[in-house]
């Protein structure tokens, strides 16, 4: 039993960020005379939150009218709570002293915990593109959440990934926390349309997790396959040679025709066809006048894809025999073709 007790009935209070926190406090007596003050923390570094005697505390309101006679309810409300408001709050009765007021009795304290939502997860991939069969790393970051407990999952096209590492910082007590996760993903040729998803679940999200995504189209490079073929003779002295560039991504591609090692023509892929898996096909052809050649001609289709070292495919065009095939349908009819006559 004591002359005056300061009662803080709530050991802890949990409030969502942006809401109002109510911190309850009652005194069992109004004697001795003196103000009630609220502090965050204890000891010499404690922070004054409210002083009944004087001061301006714009975020704080009293639950009851402290100017009312016999009022012993010293509860307060703190508006627009942020994670920085987390801590233990003490309701402290002071008594009039000479010359200064003297701390008389403190409540046991109420721990204010702030529930703050994590920020939208941001997923970032590697700086440079990588080719199928390679393993690439994706990072996911989310910040500003509290409490510390959080769940992070990775998915690729809806399938949960298992090869990832996650850290929540800081390790110790803090007003809010951040999560950082790195996942390893093995690329396949079919990943142009694939998505990597980072999913964050937290108590503040009420079962509706936040997601961050990265499109593998930003990460993957599928190198083309080349096929050079000689079409049936179009006319007595002309041969149509095509270079099929298949299954490449991204579209950025430059093709060069070489005749016996000499540059014949260079063109950039424009009118491409898209495959179901998101890769592209493109075809270029060359019309060769074989009558101008005494010797065999080595035709090379050289492709530089997405700034990578060139790949090439060659075809030996024999000039000694010109079998004539009537009525053949060739790609030379294509309006998008380019003709190159050799004399």
């Amino acid at each position: 039993e004591e002359e005056l007790q300061v009662i803080q009935p709530d050991k802890s209070v949990l409030v969502a960020a942006g809401e109002t926190a109510t911190l309850r406090c009652t005194a069992t007596s109004l004697i001795p005379v003196g103000p009630i003050q609220w502090f965050r923390g204890a000891g010499p570094g404690r922070e004054l939150i409210y002083n009944q005697k004087e001061g301006h505390f714009p975020r704080v309101t009293t639950v009851s009218d402290l100017t009312k006679r016999n009022n012993m309810d010293f509860s307060i409300r703190i508006g627009n709570i942020t994670p920085a408001d987390a801590g233990t709050y003490y309701c402290v009765k002071f008594r009039k002293g000479s010359p200064d007021d003297v701390e008389f009795k403190s409540g046991a304290g109420t721990e204010l915990s702030v529930r703050a939502k994590p920020s939208a997860p941001v997923v970032s991939g590697p700086a440079a593109r990588a080719t199928p069969q390679h393993t690439v790393s994706f990072t996911c970051e989310s910040h500003g959440f509290s409490p510390r407990d959080i769940t992070l999952k990775w998915f690729k096209n809806g399938n949960e990934l298992s090869d990832f590492q996650t850290n929540v910082d800081p390790v110790g007590e803090s007003v809010s926390y951040s999560i950082h996760s790195t996942a390893k993903v093995v690329l396949t040729r079919e990943d142009v349309h694939s998505q990597v998803i980072c999913e964050v679940a937290h108590v503040t999200l009420q079962g509706d997790p936040l997601r961050g995504t990265a499109n593998l189209s930003e990460t993957i490079r599928v190198p083309p396959t080349l096929e050079v073929t000689q079409q049936p003779v179009r006319a007595e002295n002309q041969v149509n040679v095509t270079c099929q560039v298949r299954k490449f991504y991204p579209q950025r591609l430059q093709l060069t025709w070489l005749e016996n090692g000499n540059v014949s023509r260079t063109e950039t892929a424009s009118t491409v066809t898209e495959n179901k898996d998101g890769t592209y096909n493109w075809m270029s052809w060359l019309l060769v006048n074989v009558s101008a050649h005494r010797d065999d001609v080595k035709l090379t289709c050289q492709v530089e894809h997405d700034g990578q070292p060139a790949v090439s495919k060659s075809h030996d065009l024999k000039v000694s025999a010109h079998p004539k095939e009537q009525g053949s349908n060739t790609a030379a009819e294509n309006t998008g073709s380019n003709e190159r006559n050799i004399y």
Epitope: E3, I31, K96
Partner: antibody, heavy 114, light 111 residues
Framework: QVQLQESGPGLVKPSQTLSLTCTVS????????VNWIRQPPGKGLEWIGI???????DYNSALKSRVTISKDTSKNQVFLKLSSVTAADTAVYYC????????WGQGTTVTVSS | DIVLTQSPASLAVSPGQRATITCRAS??????????MHWYQQKPGQPPKLLIY???NLESGVPARFSGSGSRTDFTLTINPVEANDAANYYC?????????FGGGTKVEIK
């Protein structure tokens, strides 16, 4: 139940120090303050001072230079010392609990005389 | 110091009648919404007994015939109806400012 009992010499010589003890029961001296009040014969009440539960003290400025209030919590006792007494210090001395003064001792009469 | 002046100095009342004692403070005894004024009854050879605290609150065990009112500097103790055993000295006391002070007392006699 709550009780307070004053004790001490009934006669003190002028210029000497008056020493009284208030023995309490039914409450803790760490939880409650104890006041000393005096009442000269046929006159009104005068507050001398208080010792709070935490051991801090507040005194009547008119007596401050001469008065000391202390306590021994383990013995449930509060002490009053008033130095350099004169005949004007002759009075019934009371101890009373806390700022509200809700419980009083019966009082002890102190006469200052040679 | 806050000086408390009680009036009247003495008062004779018949049983069943109302007795009113006033206490005027030289400065306000109000703080934080409350009046730190209390009333005590003292019978001869006895210590004072708390009747009313914080101007208007009846102490536990005290008959409801006693009531207190007032704020800031002017306070009243009312006994209604007066009974024979109410004959005593009555003191007001403030503990809003140091030093705590008592009024000079009012002697109530029963006719």
């Amino acid at each position: 139940q709550v009780q307070l009992q004053e004790s001490g010499p009934g006669l003190v010589k002028p210029s000497q120090t008056l020493s009284l003890t208030c023995t309490v029961s039914g409450f803790s001296l760490t939880g409650y303050g104890v006041n000393w009040i005096r009442q000269p014969p046929g006159k009104g009440l005068e507050w001398i001072g208080i010792i709070w539960g935490d051991g801090s003290t507040d005194y009547n400025s008119a007596l401050k230079s001469r008065v000391t209030i202390s306590k021994d919590t383990s013995k449930n006792q509060v002490f009053l010392k008033l130095s350099s007494v004169t005949a004007a210090d002759t009075a019934v001395y009371y101890c009373a609990r806390a700022g509200k003064m809700d419980y009083w001792g019966q009082g002890t009469t102190v006469t200052v005389s040679s | 110091d806050i000086v408390l002046t009680q009036s009247p100095a003495s008062l004779a009342v018949s049983p069943g009648q109302r007795a009113t004692i006033t206490c005027r403070a030289s400065e306000s005894v109000d703080s934080y919404g409350n009046s730190f004024m209390h009333w005590y009854q003292q019978k001869p050879g006895q210590p004072p007994k708390l009747l009313i605290y914080l101007a208007s609150n009846l102490e536990s065990g005290v008959p409801a015939r006693f009531s207190g009112s007032g704020s800031r500097t002017d306070f009243t103790l009312t006994i209604n109806p007066v009974e024979a055993n109410d004959a005593a000295n009555y003191y007001c006391q403030q503990n809003n400012e140091y030093p705590w002070t008592f009024g000079g007392g009012t002697k109530v006699e029963i006719k």
